[in-house]
């Protein structure tokens, strides 16, 4: 029998410096460009090799991000979120969210982590 | 998964003019960066023109600038690569590729490495 597929969902905040090259990643999303339906949020595409956000470590393909130094995420053209990015300074502190994936037992059981019994 | 498929390639004469087609399928086709690249027998893959999601932003190299023009129609998930006055040291296999992000830095539209997903290419060859 199949197990059951459900999400945690859990925040973080990931302080980066800006590295040489920038903070190393990549972004989809926006109220002009969704990317998951129903959901305007800005989602990270691609951790690049040997970049900031790499060698923290932290942030994963994946996370959406809901603010960037405090400033929220939501309702932004692309584009606006991109520059937002690109002009956040030295230092930043992005607000993000992981969905962790967590296969549970068969139906019919009881799995680990699943309350509903 | 994204696939690519070019189409349009062929034998033309120099000075000539050739239209490009990269059909894409997967995910969805508006929010890919899209870039057009050639490999020349003997040579390495070289950038010829990138285009963003949107189509508001072109970049083309020194060698194809004011002869070539590329574009996009999202609405039937298509790039193209309009070839005018082609030249013999046109001649090459060209590759349309795509990413699915925008950079949060500058980057490099020009890099290979910086595309996730390639077609298998499309031959032209001016004599």
């Known amino acids: 029998m199949n197990g059951r597929v459900d999400y945690l969902v859990t925040e973080e905040e990931i302080n980066l410096t800006r590295g040489p090259s920038g903070l190393g990643f990549n972004i989809v999303g926006g109220t002009d460009q969704q990317y998951v339906s129903n959901d305007s949020g800005i989602y990270v595409s691609r951790i690049k090799e040997n970049g900031a956000a790499a060698l923290d470590g932290r942030l994963q393909e994946g996370d959406k991000i809901l603010s960037v130094n405090g400033q929220d995420l939501k309702n932004l053209l692309h584009q606006d979120a991109v520059d937002l990015f690109r002009n956040a300074g030295y230092a930043v502190s992005l607000r993000v969210q992981h969905r962790l994936q967590v296969q549970n037992g068969p139906i019919g059981h009881r799995g680990e982590g699943d309350p509903s019994g | 998964q994204v696939q690519l498929v070019e189409s349009g390639g062929g034998l033309v004469q120099a000075g000539g003019s050739l239209r490009l087609s990269c059909a894409a399928s997967?995910?969805?086709?508006?929010?890919?960066?899209m870039g057009w690249f050639r490999q020349a027998p003997g040579k390495e893959r070289e950038f010829a023109a990138h285009?963003?999601?949107?189509?508001?932003?072109?970049n083309y190299a020194d060698s194809v600038k004011g002869r070539f023009t590329i574009s996009r129609d999202n609405a039937k998930n298509t790039m193209y690569l309009q070839m005018n006055s082609l030249k013999p040291e046109d001649t090459a296999v060209y590759y349309c590729?795509?990413?699915?992000?925008?950079?949060?830095?500058?980057?490099?539209?020009?890099?290979?490495?910086?595309?996730?997903?390639w077609g298998q290419g499309t031959q032209v060859t001016v004599s």
């Open positions: 590729a795509a990413a699915i992000w925008s950079s949060v830095d500058s980057y490099d539209h020009s890099d290979p490495l910086e595309y996730d997903y």
């Open positions: 285009i963003n999601w949107s189509g508001g932003s072109t």
């Open positions: 997967g995910r969805t086709f508006s929010t890919y960066t």
